[in-house]
Every structure is written in structure tokens, then in C-alpha cells.
């Protein structure tokens, strides 16, 4: 058993049929010694008396808010949560496996630049009685500070018969060094509590590996005289690291119709303009990627050919 | 060339060669991103490699103030990786695929380090750690980790030279 936060404790249980469970001793936080009784949740049934209460925790019915009283007055609470371990593996019932970029990916994180700011998100089908707490650091043995905000519900989607909820959190490294080569990964830890179930999820990454620039901005077209060609120009996204002579991007320019199966024109460039062939009912799209490190491409920025 | 007196390197040449190094490092190990190497006890293998750190003057301001500190750091790293790529880790079993770009990568590391340091002048170089994995699978894992680390190192070096070519060239 360990303390998650003040008056909230996590009991780690090996979860299998007829498991013996864990013996837990609760102590009432009071100077009083006599006349103390214990109850669980809303029940008025007295579970025991005395300053300490010893219980055998085997299942969710044994978890909950234990309260010690004296003469009708509440002295203190202890909330017990269960963390299940099945076949040596901690349960992951609360969050959905996003399966990208690999199986057992529960947390996904992205950064728009090298400033040390990043966003992580996760998915669940659970809509109520759910809380998240996020901590982060650079490195684990001698951790350096990363400050995370509160996790918030950022999207709701319908998937078949189920509703899916997306939560996200923003974090910022306290002393980020955008130009340095990272040697220690960022660690992100999410505590998830659903009713009386506790689970924790972790992710470890370098900012460079989760970079995904915003799409290029201000796409403009200029038809070339006596030609089918069009000069397309754009700018670096505002959110990208500066100076651009140091933090350079490379671009992919594509002309394509509505269907992916349609024919297309495509060219890669390090510049912020390119010449392509525009077709009626087609769109010109541009996306960006770090020039020197193969992290994710941005989403496409598009303008119609006409 | 970065010479003892502190004169400028051939920024444009260094830029071209460092960008080539980036391309080669990724073609030497393109799928490395799909393998979570941090789960494999990374510390003892890659803690010893020279990283370009915050105080090394490789940021735009540091380069403007005095690029020599940064260039020396990059040079150390190039020599270090060049030695690693020529070591038993890469030459031993399992043999590299004949079409592996590691050979080109090795030669390009040497080429860039020579651009940075003319004959007769020697910056101090970092000792190579004795990483001699006994098992072929350990060697394979170590290669992945070294290439992964090299990708990050040459990306920073390429940024330095691109910025230098754009803003510090005479």
C-alpha cells in the first residue's frame, strides 16, 4: 500500500481467483485514543473500533472511503483504491490502446517545436467518475523539472455504438534548451482513477522524436505566363522554432484531386516556393518536416487550384 | 576550416556534408523509430557518447559569440562516432548487409572531421568507451542505439552548419 495523495491510498493486488489479498492497517488521524469507530462509504455499519482498523483487501467491495468517528463526529478519512495486477501485468482497463505507433500505446505526445512545450493525449470510453493527474520530468534518476497543467476533456467522438472521450494535457520543460541534443528522455506519468480503480500509464520520449510541425501558412498561387505551371509559395508556421536558418524545415508539395487514386504532381523542396502543374478541380497541398531529423510530417495546408 | 587561431570553417562545405550525414544516418537505420530502445537499458551504452549540450555554444547566439567551442564539440563527436563505426561493433558478426550505408557514413564522418580540423592541429578527443558486446544480438542492439544517437547528433551539427552558412559566412 502507498499514498497517492493526502488521505488517498493505493492497494496493489495480485488479481486471480481466491487470491489472499492484502492486509491493510488503517490509522485514525486523531489524538483521541478511545471511543473510535470505523465505517465504509455511506454505510452506517460499524466495521471495528479503536484507533487502528485491520482489513483484508481482496476485491473492489473492500475498497472505498473508510471513516473513523467519535460520538457522531468525523475524525478522518482514508480512501482506498485498488491497483490490479493480472499475470504480473498491471491492468490497463481505463485507457484505450491507440495502437499507434505500436501496440500498448496509451499515451501519445506531440511537440510543435523545440521549445520544450508538448501535448499528450489519451482515449477512454468512460464518461463519469474519472480523474487524471499528470506528472513529468526530464530523466528519472536525477529528474529535471517539467510542469504540466490539468488534464482536460478535449474531444468527444462516436465510434460505432460507443462514445470515445479524448483527454489532453500540456506540459512545459522548466529549463528547455532548444538547440541542444537531448541525452535524457522526457518521462510522462499519468495516474488514472475510475471509481475505486487506480491505474498508471507512462511514456518516455525525446522531444525530437515527437516533433510535428504545424502546417505551412499563407499558401499563395501565382500562374506562370504561357505555361500550365503555377508557382506556389508559403511561409513557415508561426509556431515553429526560430531562427529558421537554424531550425530549418523541408516541404512536400502535392497537387491532387479529391480522390487519393487520382493522378498527382509531387515535388520535395527545402525552399518556401515551388512550381507545379495545376489541374481543374485539384488542390495544391504543402506539408512540412524537420529538415535534419525524420520526425512526423505536418498536416497538409491546401488551396484549390482554381 | 576551424583553425587554432579561431578563423571560420568552410561553412557551406560543412553544411553540405552534414546534411549528407543526416540522410546517410537515416538510410543506415530508417526503421529505428519503430523500436523502443530506451526499454533496453540504454544508460550504460549511450551515456558515454558525446552529446551537444546546452553550454556547448551550439545555439544561434553561442555561434555568433564564438563558434569555436561548438565546432570543437562537434569535432569531438565526429571523431568519436567515426571510431565507433569502424570498431568491432560494426565490423563483427552479424555482418552488415552489403548495401548498408554505414561505410559511406563512416567515410563522411571522417570527411567532415577533416574539414573542421586541418593537419597539424589537434583538439583533444574523447576516449572511446570499451563497448565490446559478446553476443551478436547485443552487438545488433548496440548498433541500433549508436545509429539512433548519431541521428540526433548529426541533426544538431547540420543545424549549426546551415545557420553558419546562412549568417556567419564571410
Amino acid at each position: 500500500i502507498w499514498e497517492l495523495k493526502k488521505d488517498v491510498y493505493v492497494v496493489e493486488l495480485d488479481w486471480y481467483p481466491d487470491a489472499p489479498g492484502e492486509m491493510v492497517v488503517l490509522t485514525c488521524d486523531t489524538p483521541e485514543e478511545d471511543g473510535i469507530t470505523w465505517t465504509l462509504d455511506q454505510s452506517s455499519e460499524v466495521l471495528g473500533s479503536g484507533k487502528t482498523l485491520t482489513i483484508q483487501v481482496k476485491e473492489f467491495g473492500d475498497a472505498g472511503q473508510y471513516t473513523c468517528h467519535k460520538g457522531g463526529e468525523v475524525l478522518s478519512h482514508s480512501l482506498l483504491l485498488l491497483h490490479k495486477k493480472e499475470d504480473g501485468i498491471w491492468s490497463t482497463d481505463i485507457l484505450k490502446d491507440q495502437k499507434e505507433p505500436k501496440n500498448k500505446t496509451f499515451l501519445r505526445c506531440e511537440a510543435k517545436n523545440y521549445s520544450g512545450r508538448f501535448t499528450c493525449w489519451w482515449l477512454t470510453t468512460i464518461s463519469t467518475d474519472l480523474t487524471f493527474s499528470v506528472k513529468s520530468s526530464r530523466g528519472s534518476s536525477d529528474p529535471q523539472g517539467v510542469t504540466c497543467g490539468a488534464a482536460t476533456l478535449s474531444a468527444e467522438r462516436v465510434r460505432g455504438d460507443n462514445k470515445e472521450y479524448e483527454y489532453s494535457v500540456e506540459c512545459q520543460e522548466d529549463s528547455a534548451c532548444p538547440a541542444a541534443e537531448e541525452s535524457l528522455p522526457i518521462e510522462v506519468m499519468v495516474d488514472a482513477v475510475h471509481k475505486l480503480k487506480y491505474e498508471n500509464y507512462t511514456s518516455s520520449f525525446f522531444i525530437r522524436d515527437i516533433i510535428k510541425p504545424d502546417p505551412p501558412k499563407n499558401l499563395q498561387l501565382k500562374p506562370l505566363k504561357n505555361s500550365r505551371q503555377v508557382e506556389v509559395s508559403w511561409e513557415y508556421p508561426d509556431t515553429w522554432s526560430t531562427p529558421h536558418s537554424y531550425f530549418s524545415l523541408t516541404f512536400c508539395v502535392q497537387v491532387q484531386g479529391k480522390s487519393k487514386r487520382e493522378k498527382k504532381d509531387r515535388v520535395f523542396t527545402d525552399k518556401t516556393s515551388a512550381t507545379v502543374i495545376c489541374r481543374k478541380n485539384a488542390s495544391i497541398s504543402v506539408r512540412a518536416q524537420d529538415r535534419y531529423y525524420s520526425s512526423s510530417w505536418s498536416e497538409w495546408a491546401s488551396v484549390p487550384c482554381s | 576550416r576551424a583553425v587554432p587561431g579561431g578563423s571560420s570553417p568552410a561553412w557551406t562545405q560543412c553544411q553540405q556534408l552534414s546534411q549528407k550525414l543526416c540522410t546517410l544516418a537515416w538510410s543506415a537505420h530508417p526503421l529505428v523509430g519503430h523500436m523502443d530502445l530506451r526499454e533496453e537499458g540504454d544508460e550504460e551504452t549511450t551515456n558515454d557518447v558525446p552529446h551537444i549540450q546546452c553550454g556547448d555554444g551550439c545555439d544561434p547566439q553561442g555561434l555568433r559569440d564564438n563558434s569555436q567551442f561548438c565546432l570543437q564539440r562537434i569535432h569531438q563527436g565526429l571523431i568519436f562516432y567515426e571510431k565507433l563505426l569502424g570498431s568491432d561493433i560494426f565490423t563483427g558478426e552479424p555482418s552488415l548487409l552489403p548495401d548498408s550505408p554505414v561505410g559511406q557514413l563512416h567515410a563522411s564522418l571522417l570527411g567532415l572531421s577533416q574539414l573542421l580540423q586541418p593537419e597539424g592541429h589537434h583538439w583533444e578527443t574523447q576516449q572511446i568507451p570499451s563497448l565490446s558486446p559478446s553476443q551478436p544480438w547485443q552487438r545488433l542492439l548496440l548498433r541500433f542505439k549508436i545509429l539512433r544517437s548519431l541521428q540526433a547528433f548529426v541533426a544538431v551539427a547540420a543545424r549549426v552548419f546551415a545557420h553558419g552558412a546562412a549568417t556567419l559566412s564571410p
Epitope: 493522378k263 498527382k264 527545402d270 489541374r279 | -
Partner: antibody
Framework: QVQLVQSGAEVKKPGASVKVSCKAS????????LHWVRQAPGQGLEWMGW????????ESAPKFQGRVTMTTDTSTSTAYMELRSLRSDDTAVYYC???????????WGQGTMVTVSS | EIVMTQSPATLSVSPGERATLSCRAS??????LHWYQQKPGQAPRLLIY???QSISGIPARFSGSGSGTEFTLTISSLQSEDFAVYYC?????????FGGGTKVEIK
């Protein structure tokens, strides 16, 4: 499968014109860009131009502008390349080539030998 | 127009050996570079597109690398059917241009 079949060899006199055909099968002609590339005997490849069979848009290399005409007949799934004012240095194998991507060549015809000789 | 230069013009290699072919552009072309193989009396065949992307049906012994102005086609272990002429082609800008070719012959 996607195939391009070209017309047979031609012998032409200097100053004349030649029209080479290229019949597409295994796909709809308008789904691919179509290019013409030539190769003089013992020499390398030289790009001449492209046509979008969907709308008839064409673009040719500056060297051939005013002398080459590329057309398509979608009813017969055939593309044509006409080269006018032939000179002896136009002696070459002329290839049609197609792709869904405009700038490189995925499928090639077998080639048509055009000999220009007086 | 962009001039593509291939080297060497002829490469003599023994079967089973590795062949490295070079292609240089007169200006930076990012990764807009494609490789073709041509055997005598046949049309060219696309091997690699956008510098390093492999084509289904092309043996894995063919690989490409490079960006900017310098590109390489590597044939890891030459088979008898690989003796041919290889061309690079840039697609950075029109007119599309080819290199002069590298003939890979039996040593």
C-alpha cells in the same frame, strides 16, 4: 496489367514529319499522365514532354517547342506524338511512358525506332 | 535546365560484388531523383523513386540514398541479370532531365 503498345518503326526524309502512336491497355487512359522520351542510338534518355489525356494539357521541353505535338484519343485509348521538320539527329527510339505521378515514369512502351535519312 | 552527371560512365564488377553508382545534380534537387535500369533492346524500368523509395517487384538488393546534389544507387550483390545501363532522372523542375547513364558490365 497496365501496358503501352507502340506503333512500328518508321523511316523518314529530312524535313518530313512522323506520328508515333501509343495504345494503352489495362487502365483508363485518362487516369495516368503520358510522356514521350527518346533515345538516340548509343545515347542516353531525353525527355520530350507530357500530356494529360483528361484535359489535353501539354508541356514540352524547350528544345522541342513548336516542333512537337502530343495528342490523345480517349475513345481508342491511344496517345500520339507528332514531330515535324525532322533532321538526321532526330534518329532515335521514341518511347511513350506513363504514371499516376507526373514527374517520373512507371510504365513504358516498347519503343518505336524512327530513322531520318535522305 | 538542371544537368545530371553520372559516374563512372562504365563500372566493371564481378557477379556477387557490390556496385555503387553516383549521380550529381548541377543544383540542389532535394530528393526529387529517380533511378531506372535499361537492358539492351528494352525500355527502361523504374527501380527507385524519390531518392530512396523502393518499388514493389524490384529486388531488395537495389537501394538508393542521397539528397540535395549527390545521390547513390547501390546494388548490394550483383546478379547476372543486373548487368545493364542505369540512369538517374531529376524531377525538381521542368524540363525533366536524365543523367548520361552508367553501364555496369561483367568484370
Amino acid at each position: 496489367q497496365v501496358q503501352l503498345v507502340q506503333s512500328g518503326a518508321e523511316v523518314k526524309k529530312p524535313g518530313a514529319s512522323v506520328k508515333v502512336s501509343c495504345k494503352a491497355s489495362g487502365y483508363t487512359l485518362t487516369d495516368y499522365y503520358l510522356h514521350w522520351v527518346r533515345q538516340a542510338p548509343g545515347q542516353g534518355l531525353e525527355w520530350m514532354g507530357w500530356i494529360d489525356p483528361e484535359n489535353g494539357d501539354t508541356e514540352s521541353a524547350p528544345k522541342f517547342q513548336g516542333r512537337v505535338t502530343m495528342t490523345t484519343d480517349t475513345s481508342t485509348s491511344t496517345a500520339y506524338m507528332e514531330l515535324r521538320s525532322l533532321r538526321s539527329d532526330d534518329t532515335a527510339v521514341y518511347y511513350c511512358a506513363a504514371n499516376k505521378e507526373l514527374r517520373y515514369f512507371d510504365v513504358w512502351g516498347q519503343g518505336t525506332m524512327v530513322t531520318v535519312s535522305s | 535546365e538542371i544537368v545530371m552527371t553520372q559516374s563512372p560512365a562504365t563500372l566493371s564488377v564481378s557477379p556477387g560484388e557490390r556496385a555503387t553508382l553516383s549521380c550529381r545534380a548541377s543544383q540542389s534537387i532535394s530528393i526529387n531523383l529517380h533511378w531506372y535500369q535499361q537492358k539492351p533492346g528494352q525500355a527502361p524500368r523504374l527501380l527507385i523513386y524519390f531518392a530512396s523509395q523502393s518499388i514493389s517487384g524490384i529486388p531488395a538488393r537495389f537501394s538508393g540514398s542521397g539528397s540535395g546534389t549527390e545521390f547513390t544507387l547501390t546494388i548490394s550483390s550483383l546478379q547476372s541479370e543486373d548487368f545493364a545501363v542505369y540512369y538517374c532522372q531529376q524531377s525538381n523542375s521542368f524540363p525533366l532531365t536524365f543523367g548520361g547513364g552508367t553501364k555496369v558490365e561483367i568484370k
